[in-house]
């Protein structure tokens, strides 16, 4: 945030730039939190946008029985390596097809015993607040999917007859590890010393760092035609003057005439 | 990449007797998977029989047991299938699949490599 200043009072202006601002030849060139000629107004929304999607991510051991283990399924670069996660990872968008938060899985680790597949099972949704209902259930739907699909392709006669075949108690849900994002948390933050002042707010699911001073929401405060302003002590109301009256009180709701007063004084002298 | 390139195909009597062969090239290993499937005209393709290279394992389906015989030359890199006692119901287009790992499985999504088939015909 800048304000740009000419003339002779701008050397003054230079040495006058409040809460960390630096002077770039022209303005204060503000920090985030901060505005106006000298940096010295506190900013009434903070941008906290979050991010447009939230990840999870679910560690999963599945025993391949269809496929016979050798040493070259150890190196990732080789071909051998290279065509079971071709596979794989078919089998398991057939099997996860269903789930819209679903992204694609990563093979970590292949091991003895038939063919053990350490791998990762990849998640995504929009951000809504409801985020981490969406992904706590789109984990649970992966869990019973993956336990379904290795129970039913199983091999018989020592043949499989699907795509890939597994072994029925070697499905294991090791972690699940959900990106974390706190609005409310960030916001604290972001605001500093004013941390206390600010709170979150949605609008259209997307949440909105604000001060009282942000007018248009709930905890907007209504300074008439006065000027909401941030202080280290909390939102105030700073009343204006006109041409005919003066206002006062905590949201600038009095006002007095000007001709009363002068009025009054005139009759006293 | 690996490549397949069947031959052998042709018209032959009931009872008769064929030999495929399937050349493959682009394999980095001499331990892979090899198979024949097989496509009559309306019908879903099936596997026939499969090999592994290294002799590990041989897989006939029920239906042509005792009639048809899978080898692999690993010094040829060829793949082939010794069909006889043919019936008028083997009649199908024959298509030679191959895999870098060694499968246990039947299924012809499982397998990434093919040829372009060749076409057998019993008939009288």
């Known amino acids: 945030r800048t304000t740009t200043c000419f003339g002779d009072g701008c050397q003054n202006t230079a040495s006058r730039c409040k809460n960390g601002g630096t002077w770039d030849g022209l303005k204060c060139q503000c920090p985030n939190l901060y505005y106006g000629e000298l940096c010295e107004e506190v900013v009434s929304s903070i941008d906290i946008g979050p991010p447009e999607t939230i990840s999870a991510q679910m560690e999963l051991t599945v025993t391949v029985t269809s496929v016979k283990f050798t040493e070259e399924l150890k190196n990732h670069s080789s071909q051998e390596f290279q065509e079971f996660k071709q596979t794989f990872t078919e089998q398991m968008n057939i099997v996860y097809s269903g789930i819209p938060e679903y992204v694609g899985v990563n093979i970590t680790k292949l091991r003895l015993g038939s063919v053990v597949v350490e791998h990762d099972v990849l998640l995504r949704t929009k951000y809504t607040p409801e985020y981490k209902t969406v992904l706590d259930n789109a984990t649970e739907v992966v869990k019973e999917k993956i336990t379904k699909v290795t129970t039913q392709q199983i091999m018989i006669n020592d043949i499989c007859s699907d795509m890939m075949c597994f072994n029925t108690t070697g499905t294991q849900v090791q972690n699940i590890t959900v990106t974390q994002y706190d609005p409310e948390e960030d916001c604290r933050k972001m605001a500093k010393e004013y941390g206390d002042y600010f709170v979150v707010e949605y609008r259209d699911q997307k949440p909105y760092c604000i001060s009282p001073c942000e007018p248009g929401f709930s905890v907007s405060k209504n300074c008439n035609l006065g000027k909401c302003q941030m202080s280290l002590s909390g939102p105030q109301c700073l009343c204006v003057t006109t041409e005919t009256h003066w206002y006062s009180g905590e949201t600038c709701n009095q006002g007095t005439q000007k001709s009363l007063v002068y009025g009054h004084h005139h009759h006293h002298h | 990449e690996v490549q397949l390139v069947e031959s052998g195909g042709g018209v032959v009597q009931p009872g008769g007797s064929l030999r495929l062969s399937c050349a493959a090239s682009g394999y980095t290993s001499n331990r892979y998977s090899m198979a024949w499937f097989r496509q009559a005209p309306g019908k879903e393709r099936e596997v026939v029989a499969f090999i592994w290279t290294d002799g590990g394992r041989t897989y006939y389906a029920d239906s042509v047991k005792g009639r048809f015989t899978i080898s692999h030359d690993n010094s040829k890199n060829t793949l082939y299938l010794q069909m006889n006692s043919l019936r008028a119901e083997d009649t199908a287009v024959y298509y030679c699949?191959?895999?870098?790992?060694?499968?246990?499985?039947?299924?012809?999504?499982?397998?990434?490599?093919w040829g372009q088939g060749t076409m057998v015909t019993v008939s009288s």
């Open positions: 699949a191959a895999s870098s790992l060694l499968l246990q499985t039947i299924n012809p999504r499982a397998w990434p490599y």
